[in-house]
């Protein structure tokens, strides 16, 4: 009933709880002297389904047959309407539509840990939409039985609160769950099991790792387990990997040696346990242990390259460059690099430890035969040294690679191609392709990049440290024993017209001609490799087309003579620069009047 129903009653037949698809009869009856005051014929009883009118009747009672009610609860309210007054609520009823419970399926019981309690889960089947009570029953040896009830609306789990012990691990227990509601009942199939079947060990805890003599090859994993555990699964992986290595061990007694770990690598370790070879289930995985393996001495050898620069008649500057070892080769934190410089004939040697850099520059005499050795050191030792003899890399003209070209290859890549040298191509032991940003001053601080290419290759794709709209000086070296030949070219991955023209800084007169000097365009405004400069001139105040002179771009050139100007005529001069993409805007304008005689 919805309220006190003082004025009348609502009755529901056959029941307030009905099977889906059934019909109910709802009767609303007024109690004596509870109708409209003046004339009972004007009593109008109205039946509402929720907030919608579904039937009415003039008189003291209303009968309504209702069909097609949906699953769940439907509220019916009966009201009285009298002339010239608000409707009065008489009474109401809720009707519950549902189904009998289906047979519970997949009943499964588990005891978490040797000290845990038995809990069971099952699948209820489709929702009954009615209050349904579940009773779980467990029977064991010696006619022992336990029972637990559950009155939650969605009940699919119950914990008996009892602990099975390993005294008789082969004893059988049987569980059954029964669902009951107003429309029927149904029981699951019985589930029979032993202690070993249902006890799921707690995950291992207190996991530790030890490296004997700080060596990765002598590594033992330790953990603690419940007493009856027979089997363990170990899984481990480098922290940056998604794939696990898996190991199964029997009777490990809380320790296992791992033999295939990589040095100086952070690993994640987890362990799981099981009580019996083929009965029961694995525990959850333990919490992860994260640990870094110890360092080992580096393997591999450094990739070393060098550059020579003439200083004066007796001295030369040597700049050595090397690449970091890969993580798998470094096998630890590289603390320093050891560079040894030796004059081969005199035997003089100089050793230096370099930290924080992968380059070293020194000045040596131009005479003598020099060699260098470079190795990388971590806390455990050093890599094998890379030894190279210092030679004139471009001395052997016959070893110079031919027809070197550099073409843009997609975003921030340059494809360098060449032809083998004229001299016996089979003499080439390797090619080295070197590139660095082009700086007009020939700045030695500009980072050097290089890659090595096998002797049968005639192309290389360079992509490391390549930026758009920057011009690179690219050299291809052919190395053969203690000889080398080289060819160079300029290249860029992406270009457009320069943003500005050269700035004329001086015009001087020399024997009837003029010499124009200019400042280079700043590198960030060149927008790629410059191909030409153009010098334009025309008579001041003239509307005629300017004359021009086009000069091929050379890195070091910043002046050029012009000898076709008339004396005592004032000219306006300016310059532009060109890349393969087009011409820059004008640089500054300068006026000049040649004083001397015409040629």
């Amino acid at each position: 009933k919805i309220d006190a129903c003082k004025r009348g009653d609502v009755t529901v037949k056959p029941s307030h709880v009905i099977l889906l698809g059934s019909t109910v009869n709802i009767t609303c009856s007024l109690k004596p002297r509870q109708g409209c005051f003046h004339y009972s014929r004007r009593n109008k009883l109205i039946l509402y389904k929720f907030d919608r009118r579904i039937n009415f009747h003039h008189g003291h009672s209303l009968n309504s047959q209702v069909t097609g009610l949906p699953l769940g609860t439907t509220l019916f309210v009966c009201k009285l309407a009298c002339i010239n007054s608000d409707e009065i609520q008489i009474c109401g009823a809720e009707i519950f539509v549902g189904v009998a419970p289906e047979q519970p399926q997949n009943l499964s019981c588990i005891q978490k840990g040797e000290q845990g309690t038995v809990a069971c889960t099952w699948e209820r089947g489709r929702d009954t939409h009615l209050y349904t009570e579940y009773t779980l029953q467990l029977s064991g040896p010696k006619n022992l039985t336990w029972q637990k009830q559950c009155k939650d609306i969605y009940c699919d789990y119950l914990d008996f609160g009892i602990n099975l012990t390993p005294e008789s691990p082969e004893s059988n227990f049987t569980a059954k769950v029964t669902a009951v509601n107003s429309l029927g009942s149904s029981s699951s199939l019985p589930s029979t099991f032993t202690f070993l079947d249902i006890v799921r060990p707690l995950p291992p805890w207190d996991i530790r790792i030890k490296f004997q003599k700080a060596s990765v090859s002598r590594c033992t994993l330790y953990w603690r387990d419940e007493g009856l555990v027979l089997l363990n699964r170990l899984r481990y992986r480098p922290s940056n990997s998604r794939l696990w290595n898996m190991v199964n061990v029997t009777k490990a007694k809380g320790r296992h040696d791992l033999l295939d770990l990589k040095p100086f690598t952070e690993y994640e370790f987890q362990i799981s346990s099981k009580l019996h070879l083929y009965k029961g289930s694995w525990s959850d995985w333990s919490e992860s242990l994260r640990a870094q393996t110890p360092e080992e001495e580096p393997t591999g050898m450094l990739d070393v390259w060098y550059m020579k620069r003439h200083i004066d008649y007796s001295r030369q500057q040597i700049s050595l460059f090397w690449k970091n070892l890969s993580v798998s080769e470094a096998r630890g934190k590289i603390l320093h690099y050891q560079v040894t410089l030796q004059e081969l004939t005199g035997g003089k040697a100089m050793t230096q430890n370099i930290t924080g850099h992968t380059s070293w520059t020194t000045v040596i005499p131009r005479t003598g035969n020099w060699a260098v050795a470079v190795s990388a050191a971590n806390s455990k030792g050093s890599s094998l040294p890379t030894r190279i003899n210092i030679m004139n890399l471009c001395e052997a003209g016959l070893l110079a690679p031919r027809q070197v070209s550099a073409n843009s290859e997609g975003m921030d890549n340059i494809l360098v191609t060449w032809q083998p040298p004229r001299k016996d191509p089979s003499a080439v032991q390797e090619y080295v392709v070197e590139w660095r940003e082009l700086h007009p001053g020939g700045d030695t601080q500009v980072p050097l990049n290089w890659l090595r290419s096998r002797p049968y290759n005639v192309s290389a794709l360079i992509s490391e440290n390549i930026k758009s709209y920057i011009c690179y000086e690219i050299r291809v070296y052919a190395l053969s024993g203690d000889q080398g030949g080289c060819s160079s070219i300029l290249g860029n991955s992406k270009h457009k017209a320069p943003l500005s023209g050269p700035h004329i800084n001086a015009i001087t007169e020399e024997k009837g001609s003029i010499l124009i000097s200019w400042n280079s365009i700043p590198v960030q405004e060149q927008m790629g490799c410059l191909l030409h400069y153009r010098i334009y001139w025309k008579e001041r105040d003239s509307n005629s087309q300017p004359q021009l002179c086009e000069i091929p771009y050379r890195v070091s050139q910043n002046s050029h003579p012009i000898n076709s100007l008339q004396p005592r005529v004032t000219y306006v001069l300016w310059m532009t620069a060109l890349t393969a993409a087009g011409e820059s805007s004008h640089g500054n304008e300068r006026e000049f009047c040649l004083q001397g005689k015409a040629n």
Epitope: R52, R53, I54, F56, H57, L62, S64, Q65, T67, G68
Partner: nanobody, 123 residues
Framework: QVQLQESGGGLVQPGGSLRLTCVAS????????MSWVRQPPGKGREWISA????????DYADSVMGRFTISRDNAKNTVYLQMNSLKSEDTAVYYC????????????????WGQGTQVTVSS
Amino acid sequence: QVQLQESGGGLVQPGGSLRLTCVASGFPFSTHAMSWVRQPPGKGREWISAINSGGDSTDYADSVMGRFTISRDNAKNTVYLQMNSLKSEDTAVYYCAKYEDCSDYDCSSRASWGQGTQVTVSS
């Protein structure tokens, strides 16, 4: 699904009579109260009459009281509206509907209305 088919409309002179018929299908007719509704041209719909599921109680809007009579035949799944003393203001499209979708209390749902039948009262 619920289907309601109205018929019997037409052109009639003021003071004349018409009988509208509504045949229902797709639901248990005898357990549902039914209504007649009309929609004059250019105006909103207006509930005019209802009959309960047993056919023993009826209700009318004041505008048609004494002139219109609603009745039903549960054996034929049919509801009728006898209209007498018709006036020009009775001109409208007439629909039948389940009472739960349209009553004197609430006529907002068009879930189970029929297609309607046109009644025109004109001299």
